[in-house]
């Protein structure tokens, strides 16, 4: 007779990443008895919520419940019913909601309130919805990739379990690009972190880490594009704007009200006597790059060295995992290979941006035009941000690894967030007091 399989002793956790452009739900699973081991939690599901980011629901909060339904129902299906009540659900909102809160705390609270009420209706253990700080977003992204890469494990292995593993315990830096913000987080080499706001101290698995992190609000790819357009229309003073960041032959009408809707364009705002203007693409990488650089103020630095806008940045150290939009954009452009040099990436971008729009539409017929039209800008922006913003060089470029998933789990802040909130990263190596949430932030 066949033995009956013993019921799995596993646990689940759900994290919703409420980003500026969309919301994604992640389901994580781990063996219950190995909670404090490193590398045991893995992602079993990702569900992308149809529609925009939650900050866009400010005028239609009543639609939030329906918006979240499909993915929450998917979670109900994936997680065994017996586990529902003990499965924690966390929602973390990032820069899109940070921007909304800057405009109106009341409106941001209203959105979060409706989100909380909607999520409370499900049979899971809802733990709350909150806007996480940029510092947390950077820190949790760093924790995620290093946890998945096995960097917190004290056991040095003679074999490599992940493609990026270098068999040493040197942590990877984390580069995260969203729609509204971008984060850089790494352990500097014997360098004092000159600005306290950018310093984090962790004790994880018995080891101390002094981590540098900064989140640049308004420098996610979507908000950077709005900034660039607002800057350019100010200089152009014209109803038509030739834009080197869009393909030759591309045309798009932009509403001035949309342009000035975001706090990110406030510094460029001027009274324009027209309600709309037309972008005409001219597809020139070099000129696009030049135009993007004007968004980075590098003339002011009160520290020994800065990234841009007067923000301290220590000398880059070690390898970096570049994920989220860094990965999605570079993957689309077929530039994620470790073998592709920075010079080659630049060459490819020059060719790509110069391709006529009609040709691009034909070559990528399955891609939504809204996204397709912005890859020239996004790719150029990534290069500008990494090279001029963060001071990577042609040589240090090879230390950037564009990562989508590690061991089947998405690189991003959500896993680190859940590990922390469920106390699954102990401060000490043996079974000991777990790290409290307040230790982080």
């Amino acid at each position: 007779t066949q033995n009956k399989a013993l019921p799995e002793n596993v646990k689940y956790g759900i994290v919703l990443d409420a980003g500026s452009s969309h919301t994604s739900l992640y389901i994580y699973k781990w063996p219950a008895e190995k909670e404090n081991d490193t590398g045991v939690v893995h992602q079993v599901e990702e569900c992308r919520v149809k529609g925009p980011g939650i900050s866009k629901f400010v005028q239609k909060v009543n639609e939030i419940g329906i918006y979240l339904t499909d993915c929450m129902e998917r979670a109900r299906e994936v997680i065994p019913r017996s586990q529902h009540q003990e499965t924690p659900v966390y929602l973390g909102a990032t820069a899109g909601m940070r921007l909304l809160r800057m405009e109106s705390e009341e409106l941001a609270d209203r959105v979060l309130d409706v989100v909380e009420r909607s999520l409370s209706n499900y049979p899971f253990d809802f733990q709350g919805a909150r806007i996480i700080t940029g510092q947390e977003e950077g820190a949790y992204g760093w924790i995620t990739i290093n946890y998945l890469l096995g960097k917190f494990s004290q056991k040095t292995r003679w074999f490599s379990i992940v493609p990026y593993e270098t068999n040493n315990q040197e942590t990877f830096g984390a580069l995260d690009l969203g729609g509204a913000s971008t984060q850089v987080t790494f352990v500097p080499q014997n360098q004092t972190i000159e600005s306290p706001d950018n310093a984090l101290q962790f004790r994880l698995y018995g080891k101390d880490y002094n981590v540098y992190t900064h989140s640049f609000l308004c420098y996610g790819k979507d908000q950077a594009l709005w900034q660039k357009l607002a800057k350019d229309i100010q200089v152009a003073s014209n109803e038509i704007l030739r834009d080197p960041c869009f393909h030759p032959g591309y045309k798009k009408v932009v509403n001035v009200s949309d342009l000035y809707k975001t706090p990110c364009t406030k510094r460029f705002e001027m009274t324009l006597p027209f309600q709309q203007f037309e972008i005409q693409g001219i597809g020139n990488y070099q000129q696009c790059h030049q135009s993007i650089l004007e968004l980075f103020n590098t003339s002011y630095c009160p520290y020994s060295q800065c990234a841009f806008n007067g923000i301290f940045l220590p000398p880059l150290q070690g390898d970096f995992g570049a994920f989220s939009a860094f990965y999605f954009v570079m993957k689309f452009l077929n530039l994620t290979s470790e073998k592709v040099s920075q010079e080659k990436v630049t060459e490819m971008m020059k060719k790509f941006c110069a391709q006529p729009w009609e040709e691009i539409k034909t070559s990528y017929a399955g891609v939504k035009e809204k996204y397709l039209s912005e890859y020239c800008f996004s790719g150029t922006y990534i290069l500008s941000l990494l090279l001029q913003g963060y001071h990577f060089t042609a040589d240090s470029w090879e230390h950037i690894h564009f990562i989508g998933k590690i061991q089947g789990s998405d690189a991003g802040w959500t896993l680190g967030y859940m590990l922390n909130l469920t106390n699954m990263i102990p401060a000490e190596q043996p079974l000991s007091t777990p790290l409290s949430h307040s230790t982080y932030v």
Epitope: A236, N238, L241, R242, D243, F274, Q287
Partner: antibody, heavy 119, light 107 residues
Framework: EVQLVESGGGLVKPGGSLKLPCAAS????????MHWVRQAPEKGLEWVAY????????YYADTVKGRFTISRDNAKNTLFLQMTSLRSEDTAMYYC????????????WGQGTTLTVAS | DIQMTQSPSSLSASLGERVSLTCRAS??????LIWLQQKPDGTIKRLIY???TLDSGVPKRFSGNRSGSDYSLTISSLESEDFADYYC?????????FGGGTKLEIK
């Protein structure tokens, strides 16, 4: 081939008026902002006025504000500079130039037309 | 208004010589600067835009550079047709303002 041709210059008495046209060809005139720039004898270039493609944005130099009016007729591909209350210091060569950010900022200029204000 | 201070106001140089003209902006203009050449017959031609981008058809001996608020036009090896007047113009804000000009003469 892009061409800008100014005309209408001449001798005008102080306090008088004159309208300078600039005829454009070889490009989509209605897409471009247009400028008037002048140069007094033996002097440098001086920006005078600007009009956007749809005429919704207009700027003037302080020296001509209230006396000069820039306008355009997109159907006729023509730019105009109406000058009133002319003074001797308005004596100059007047140039028109086209403008379209990013790469066409004052990239083509006319050959100029001479205005002399004297009694 | 943004003042553009151009130097030198005149310059005598020989064929084959390397020359540099400079414009200094009184306020931040973020690279929004063009260089123009005016021939003795009054013809005006744009050479460089966005501080350093060479116009198509302009010889490679011309180059534009930016260092902080200083902008320069360099001609690496003078040719006879380069003797003319040169102007910089900022297009960061209105009113648009020109530098005072540089008269480049043959020595």
């Amino acid at each position: 081939e892009v061409q800008l041709v100014e005309s209408g210059g001449g001798l005008v008495k102080p306090g008088g008026s004159l309208k300078l046209p600039c005829a454009a060809s070889g490009f989509t005139f209605s897409d471009y902002g247009m400028h008037w720039v002048r140069q007094a004898p033996e002097k440098g270039l001086e920006w005078v006025a600007y009009i956007s493609s749809g005429s919704s944005i207009i700027y003037y130099a302080d020296t001509v504000k209230g006396r000069f009016t820039i306008s355009r007729d997109n159907a006729k591909n023509t730019l105009f500079l109406q000058m009133t209350s002319l003074r001797s210091e308005d004596t100059a060569m007047y140039y028109c130039a086209r403008d379209l950010y990013y790469d066409h900022v004052l990239d083509y200029w006319g050959q100029g037309t001479t205005l002399t204000v004297a009694s | 208004d943004i003042q553009m201070t151009q130097s030198p106001s005149s310059l005598s140089a020989s064929l084959g010589e390397r020359v540099s003209l400079t414009c200094r902006a009184s306020q931040e203009i973020s690279g929004y600067l063009i260089w123009l050449q005016q021939k003795p017959d009054g013809t005006i031609k744009r050479l460089i835009y966005a501080a350093s981008t060479l116009d198509s058809g302009v010889p490679k001996r011309f180059s534009g550079n930016r260092s902080g608020s200083d902008y320069s036009l360099t001609i690496s090896s003078l040719e006879s047709e380069d003797f003319a007047d040169y102007y910089c113009l900022q297009y960061a804000s209105y009113p648009r303002t020109f530098g005072g000009g540089t008269k480049l003469e043959i020595k």
